[in-house]
Amino acid sequence: LIIGFGISGRHSITVTTVASAGNIGEDGILSCTFEPDIKLSDIVIQWLKEGVLGLVHEFKEGKDELSEQDEMFRGRTAVFADQVIVGNASLRLKNVQLTDAGTYKCYIITSKGKGNANLEYKTGAFSMPEVNVDYNASSETLRCEAPRWFPQPTVVWASQVDQGANFSEVSNTSFELNSENVTMKVVSVLYNVTINNTYSCMIENDIAKATGDIKVTESEIKRRSHLQLLNSKAS
């Protein structure tokens, strides 16, 4: 969490951002909030990116002002116009690219004063893993698949019964480049598994950590998966 204060003759206002991550090819949110103003027409929002000459986005007098927007962001940005009045300056970024990573500044002017805060934005690819029973294998085998990751993640298997066990000798992980030549499909196979035991396939890079769990019993297969973005620090 980054909290910034204005520095000028006017009063300063508090601006708060949260470091976040964008999933390549999908839409992302750069989060920024500020002390709200009564009049929308008195609020100016500017998003800037370190190393980029033009603006990322500007919103003033109740509407977008994109005359100085940098080419790399053309047609890809929007604020939540109906939420600006309540202090939400978050930016929606469409079709996130690897090159969108960097340091952004959320700069706010209201009738109360000015303020800004920086935001670290990481980009990559992450997806939920799915763990299934591999019926094509000769022994009891599990297969963990996740369609899109970048940078290349680590994959670790764990089990509830054999806590702390190292499964690297009985697992095999491969990374297959997807058609856009950036992200990769992750496939990991775990051999010689047993029933009535929960196995977890954990995939992690510097952006996200995802886990897929499976438990096979005589009567059912239970699955669960979750994904967590790393380094979501507020400023």
Partner: nanobody, 122 residues
């Protein structure tokens, strides 16, 4: 309560054919893989064949490949084992059982019927 009732066994000459049936009740049949297992009198149980819930996947123990065919009728909650080219070594009590997956370690199976005896002899 899970119930599995096998039928169709009998005495058959070498090279002959039989069709075994297993009527299942007490559980949602379409949620389970069904398996056939056999036991030669005085010996341990041996897995024979399996079929997936939608019949899209089947597999067999090596010694019965090309001679036995497993099938199922989900409308009737019944699994079948069609046996051709029977040999003396196929003589056994045949059981059907269920499991949540296609895995087929004998110790994983919990529900058994009374079995049906197949005797191959001239």
């Amino acid at each position: 309560e899970v119930q599995l009732v096998e039928s169709g066994g009998g005495l058959v000459q070498p090279g002959g054919s039989l069709r075994l049936s297993c009527a299942a009740s007490g559980f949602t049949f379409t949620d389970f893989w069904m398996h056939w297992v056999r036991q030669v009198p005085g010996k341990g149980r041996e897995w024979v064949s399996r079929i997936s819930p939608d019949s899209s996947s089947t597999s067999y123990e090596d010694s019965v490949k090309g001679r036995f065919t497993i099938s199922r009728d989900n409308a009737k909650n019944t699994v079948y084992l069609q046996m051709h080219g029977l040999r003396a070594e196929d003589t056994a009590v045949y059981y059907c059982t269920r499991f949540s997956t296609g895995w087929h370690r004998i110790e994983y199976f919990q529900h058994w019927g009374q079995g049906t005896l197949v005797t191959v002899s001239s």
